[in-house]
Interface confidence: low
């Protein structure tokens, strides 16, 4: 994975929240849910009320990157999805408000959002080769690809 030092000179400025209260389903149609107080997992749900609802905030890069850079917040909370290292669970970081500017090691809060048809991918800005992923019998984590599932469907208007 790419070291933080490659990215430390890039500054990301918060623009606005671009999506509210959406659900993320992986390619096996498993929804992301709260495993416990600090991290997430995926499960096939009969009732989508149990799924985690996310908000997505957009950031603009000082590098004028063509990629869409986003932060993921659990709706109605002050918990933000934070990347660690490869095969490590993504964590939920508590912050009083959405960061106005992000740079350096704080880029573990940011993801490049890419869409291919109905498939959505979230690549860690801190680790550009790694994606938010689900893995059997494990937390939602960062992974480079199979056997982890890295593509998600966004289900909106579930509130």
């Amino acid at each position: 994975s790419a070291p933080f030092s490659f990215l430390s000179n890039v500054k990301y400025n918060f623009m606005r929240i671009i999506k509210y209260e959406f659900i993320l389903n992986d390619a096996l149609n498993q929804s992301i849910i709260r495993a416990n107080d600090q991290y997430l997992t995926a499960a096939a749900l009969h009732n989508l009320d149990e799924a985690v609802k996310f908000d997505m905030g957009a950031y603009k890069s000082s590098k004028d990157d063509a990629k869409i850079t986003v932060i993921l917040r659990i709706s109605k909370t002050q918990l933000y999805v934070t990347a660690q290292d490869e095969d490590q669970p993504v964590l939920l970081k508590e912050m009083p408000e959405i960061p106005k500017t992000i740079t350096g090691s704080e880029t573990n809060l940011l993801f490049f959002w890419e869409t291919h048809g109905t498939k959505n991918y979230f690549t860690s800005v801190a680790h550009p080769n790694l994606f938010i992923a689900t893995k059997q019998d494990y937390w939602v984590c960062l992974a480079g690809g199979p056997p982890s599932i890295t593509d998600f469907q966004i289900l909106e208007n579930q509130a």
Epitope: S75, L79, E94
Partner: antibody, heavy 122, light 107 residues
Framework: QIQLVQSGPELKKPGETVKISCKAS????????MNWVKQAPGKDLKRMAW????????TYADDFKGRFAFSLETSASTAYLQINNLKNEDTATYFC???????????????WGQGTSVTVSS | NIQMTQTTSSLSASLGDRVTISCRAS??????LNWYQQKPDGTVKLLIY???RLHSGVPSRFSGSGSGTDYSLTISNLEQEDIATYFC?????????FGGGTKLEIN
Amino acid sequence: QIQLVQSGPELKKPGETVKISCKASGYTFRNYGMNWVKQAPGKDLKRMAWINTYTGESTYADDFKGRFAFSLETSASTAYLQINNLKNEDTATYFCARGIYYYGSSYAMDYWGQGTSVTVSS
Amino acid sequence: NIQMTQTTSSLSASLGDRVTISCRASQDISNCLNWYQQKPDGTVKLLIYYTSRLHSGVPSRFSGSGSGTDYSLTISNLEQEDIATYFCQQGKTLPYAFGGGTKLEIN
């Protein structure tokens, strides 16, 4: 059953340092954040900080930045609160409390330690 | 920051009484309201979370209600062991403030 057991009462002089422990049992320590809450005599309960028991990272309330340090010994399922350069106004009972989000968004503290009384007096 | 107010700081009642303790938030907290009991020996327990849900092991004589900014805790049949101070707390936004507490005493 779930228990949080704190260290005993402390009597300190101004300028000294105190370190309080909170040992958790009955659940997976790294799955839940830990709070520290202050209750000064005759005052409200006040949440001082939340510590992520997976990373050890703390989020401090505004009034508790500077002289306060929160740490973990994960292998022993223990959280610590250290207060440096003690002042008279630090006289209080300090509680550790496990944090939990109900329904994904409503925060509560579902299990509490018995409290540790700290008295600062010259 | 959201402020929590418990206007009644102490309350006197008789065993067997129905007692209601109220709590007001300075803005809408969307039912993210918890109640805690602090016994005279200092021990604190969560009684009710998310306005009306009983925490495990809490007797059914305790109940909670409310919405928006106004919430209440009711003890339907007061027992000696309920003598304590009761605190509300909002769980909606940091720093998750507590109310000042209501001390419940026996007549």
